[in-house]
Interface confidence: medium
Amino acid sequence: EACHPGFYGPDCKLRCSCNNGEMCDRFQGCLCSPGWQGLQCEREGIQRMTPKIVDLPDHIEVNSGKFNPICKASGWPLPTNEEMTLVKPDGTVLHPKDFNHTDHFSVAIFTIHRILPPDSGVWVCSVNTVAGMVEKPFNISVKVLPKPLNAPNVIDTGHNFAVINISSEPYFGDGPIKSKKLLYKPVNHYEAWQHIQVTNEIVTLNYLEPRTEYELCVQLVRRGEGGEGHPGPVRRFTTASIGLP
């Protein structure tokens, strides 16, 4: 039910006396213009708003190594660098390594140089401003990068090719495996490792040099940023000479 113009409240008994001619809402009273607050919009300034943490998933899977978690928060006043912290499961309080803000959000970027499986557990993004405290727990699961336990096997060789069983399983560490690389290079040359992406366990290496000793190993990649594991054990083989059966 509407109140008479200029009145509001449960029984329409409260009178709006909005300073700057703002609209009178039947339930809330004066609807202050941006930059004003108070019952009659008599005070300059934006009303304080308890901070809110946004865009932070409940669960994050990360690969061992460098990790840069982000906490993003709104509120008024906007949280400052000093007001945003990240708490590890062991209670260690981390402060942002990088910080920026837009008109509506503060973004704190933290750096963990080497995150390891024992760091798995509940982490807390915590924001603490004059308008209030807010926390958002989230679960981090730290995965071990995969590494093959065995060296690849050489099934067959010619003067310029080799047929390889990459033996990607079993492997140490966590899956699932997103992709596999076969790395190879001549032993006595100062060349960088070359690699090919492989999808099958059996792969043929072409365009090899005859009568040359090569080194082979396999690198496994799991999902997520920084998912490349360490190369596995190395296998050596020598290509055949030209003209010999």
Partner: antibody, heavy 119, light 107 residues
Framework: EVQLVESGGGLVQPGGSLRLSCAAS????????IHWVRQAPGKGLEWVAS????????YYADSVKGRFTISADTSKNTAYLQMNSLRAEDTAVYYC????????????WGQGTLVTVSS | DIQMTQSPSSLSASVGDRVTITCRAS??????VAWYQQKPGKAPKLLIY???FLYSGVPSRFSGSGSGTDFTLTISSLQPEDFATYYC?????????FGQGTKVEIK
């Protein structure tokens, strides 16, 4: 070992004042949030106020705003709750509690101190 | 303010029983819910934080679950020392608020 010890409770008349202390030890006081939580006889838990000593920010329940003041002395590792204009409904056991991560999960609590407001 | 509504307010159970206490938040609090145990004349003790994580030193018969608005504390096999009052609490935002408590009594 983490310890929180409250003191300062007692009998006070309506309209009177009382100052509660919470002496903390066994953890980094400045890296924590200190909370006061009360429990009226036979009732549940009610959060009263919090302070984060590292930046001095304070927070209050609406029921005590303007009457109670929380403060902390980091040199003494002690938090205080100054209670003015006390009312009968403020009668309760007052606990101080802490959380290492500036948040509202309270992992250690003191033994509590009884405040009775009565004429 | 966020209201936390616990149910039941009291229950009677026997040693060895499985006990479930629920807590509903008036708005989404993510997983920022803690559970406490309180015995008469004693301070509350933290059992569960972040909805499902067991606080150190708490027996594994206690477990928590839930996210958003609905949360549960479960005691898988009630022990004599578990007869107490249990409180849920949202630690999501200012002001932190507690449920009204659930008293677990001996049948």
């Amino acid at each position: 070992e983490v310890q929180l010890v409250e003191s300062g409770g007692g009998l006070v008349q309506p309209g009177g004042s009382l100052r509660l202390s919470c002496a903390a030890s066994g953890f980094t006081f400045s890296n924590s949030a200190i909370h006061w939580v009360r429990q009226a006889p036979g009732k549940g838990l009610e959060w009263v106020a919090s302070i984060t000593p590292y930046n001095g920010y304070t927070y209050y329940a609406d029921s005590v705003k303007g009457r109670f003041t929380i403060s902390a002395d980091t040199s003494k590792n002690t938090a205080y709750l100054q209670m003015n204009s006390l009312r009968a409904e403020d009668t309760a056991v007052y606990y101080c509690a802490r959380r290492q991560s500036y948040s509202y999960v309270m992992d250690y609590w003191g033994q509590g101190t009884l405040v009775t407001v009565s004429s | 303010d966020i209201q936390m509504t616990q149910s039941p307010s009291s229950l009677s159970a026997s040693v060895g029983d499985r006990v479930t206490i629920t807590c509903r938040a008036s708005q989404d609090v993510s997983t920022a819910v803690a559970w406490y145990q309180q015995k008469p004349g004693k301070a509350p003790k933290l059992l569960i934080y972040s909805a499902s994580f067991l606080y150190s030193g708490v027996p594994s018969r206690f477990s928590g679950s839930g996210s958003g608005t609905d949360f549960t504390l479960t005691i898988s096999s009630l022990q004599p020392e578990d007869f107490a009052t249990y409180y849920c609490q949202q630690s999501y935002t200012t002001p932190p608020t507690f449920g009204q408590g659930t008293k677990v009594e001996i049948k």
